[in-house]
Interface confidence: low
């Protein structure tokens, strides 16, 4: 163990730009201060002298999601009988670099609505709100990523297991299906241009069958049909 109390395992946990830095160890002997900066700026302190091992840095990283950020965790003795106070140069450890636009995970999408009319199935994905602000309002996921953001629809006849896929760079799918057949489907957010963290988890599965539709209504889950 590091007797200086230096933090370790600094890890960025970020989904749809909600961004938290986590580290170890949880210690009764030390408290921590987190500092964050871009390559061009001075360090800014956050989460002063906290006993926690996480710090929410969302407010800092959403200022410019295209910037690359680095954080560091400074360690201080929790109880210090020394009258000189805290050390001037406390031990610290740097985080990996973090570029929100490239590194935030895509959250699980939600199917906002769907409608099957004849041989057409229309599925709309809810445009998730992020914590990125422009002109005082929170931007949607698509407003941040633009056409970098695609959605993939996985769909299959309720009576079979063979999945088909469709892709859109809007939030809507309009696909051809067999008339009179019930279909189930889920969606996944995708940023094809990324080298990593390209895909979100899949959404919950929805189905067009009346029986399942009634079951959802009984549990208070309503869909807005176009």
């Amino acid at each position: 163990a590091d007797t200086t109390g230096r933090a370790y395992n600094l890890t960025w946990k970020s989904t749809n730009f909600k961004t938290i830095l986590e580290w170890e160890p949880k210690s009764i002997d030390h408290v921590y201060t987190v500092q964050i900066s871009t390559r061009l700026e001075n360090w800014k302190s956050k989460c002063f002298l906290t006993a926690e091992t996480e710090c929410d840095l969302t407010d800092e990283v959403v200022k410019d999601v295209g910037q690359t950020y680095m954080a560091r965790v400074l360690s201080y003795p929790a109880r210090n009988g020394n009258t000189t106070g805290f050390p001037e140069e406390p031990p610290f450890r740097n985080s990996p670099e973090f570029t929100p636009y490239l590194d935030t995970n895509l959250g699980q999408p939600t199917i906002q609505s769907f409608e099957q009319v004849g041989t057409k199935l229309n599925v709309t994905v809810q445009d998730a709100r992020t914590l990125v602000r422009r002109n005082g309002t929170f931007l949607s996921l698509r407003a941040v990523f633009g056409k970098d953001l695609n959605y993939t629809l996985y769909y299959w006849r309720a009576s079979s297991t063979g999945k088909k896929t469709a892709t859109t760079n809007t939030n809507e799918f309009l696909i051809d299906v067999d008339k009179g057949e019930n279909y189930c489907f889920s969606v996944q957010a995708v940023i094809p241009s990324r080298k990593r963290k390209q895909r979100s988890p899949e959404s919950l599965t929805e189905c067009t069958s009346r029986e399942q539709g009634r079951a959802r209504e009984m549990t208070g889950h309503h869909h807005h049909h176009h």
Partner: antibody, heavy 124, light 108 residues
């Protein structure tokens, strides 16, 4: 107020490579797409292609084999290269910002900020 | 490729008159991705209308957009001297994004 300032060589010989750069002032590259459009003398507008801040591109298929659009986020600028030019590539070349706008669930794209244009002439 | 055909090619009108410009698409275009631009000689195009109906920031309310599917219209309710220019429709929903050939609104 976001402004686009563009520059590059204005006179080329056939078979040379056209190279233009567009710098973004007063705003970030991220969250937008960045386009190149051209306009031959006395004619209409033709979309060449676009790039996102992360480097993903879309090109006009009619030019795809000759076009490269790149982005340099550290300099807040993006560039166009068009190889093997001919007289048919003589045009005013514009850079533009392709903005996503969301209102009550509707998503829209439009080119709301344009560079002033660079006149490129291809002549032997 | 979606071909946008604008008509008429030239519109000769007097200040104060109403101008109606048409943009017809070779296949259906989502109104979300249909925009109109104004261009004056020696200048870059200027965004007027996005999403087929919404006026861009700073555009006077005499400009309005309408239509859906394959037929879209830009209307200038009362022409002002500064409105005489070339107008382009554009679709940005399907690659390659395309512009119409333009309608020139000239002083009669």
């Amino acid at each position: 107020q976001v402004q686009l300032q563009q520059w590059g060589a204005g006179l080329l010989k056939p078979s040379e490579t056209l190279s233009l750069t567009c710098a973004v002032y007063g705003g970030s590259l991220s969250g937008y797409y960045w386009s190149w459009i051209r306009q031959p003398p006395g004619k209409g507008l033709e979309w060449i292609g676009e790039i996102g801040a992360s480097g993903s591109t879309r090109y006009n298929p009619s030019l795809k084999s000759r076009v490269t659009i790149s982005v340099d986020t550290s300099k807040n600028q993006f560039s166009l290269k068009l190889s093997s030019v001919t007289a048919a590539d003589t045009a005013v070349y514009y850079c533009a910002r392709d903005t996503p706008y969301y209102y009550e669930g509707g998503y829209y794209y439009y080119m709301d900020v344009w560079g002033k244009g660079t006149t490129v002439t291809v002549s032997s | 490729e979606i071909v946008l055909t604008q008509s008429p090619g030239t519109l000769s009108l007097s200040p104060g008159e109403r101008a109606t410009l048409s943009c017809r698409a070779s296949q259906s275009v989502s109104s979300s991705f249909l925009a109109w631009y104004q261009q004056k000689p020696g200048q870059a195009p200027r965004l007027l209308i996005y999403g087929a109906y919404s006026r861009a920031t700073g555009i006077p309310d005499r400009f309005s957009g309408s239509g859906s599917g394959t037929d879209f219209t830009l209307t200038i309710s009362r022409l002002e001297p500064e409105d005489f220019a070339v107008y382009y429709c554009q679709q940005a929903g399907v690659v390659p994004y395309t512009f119409g050939g333009g309608t020139k609104v000239e002083i009669k």
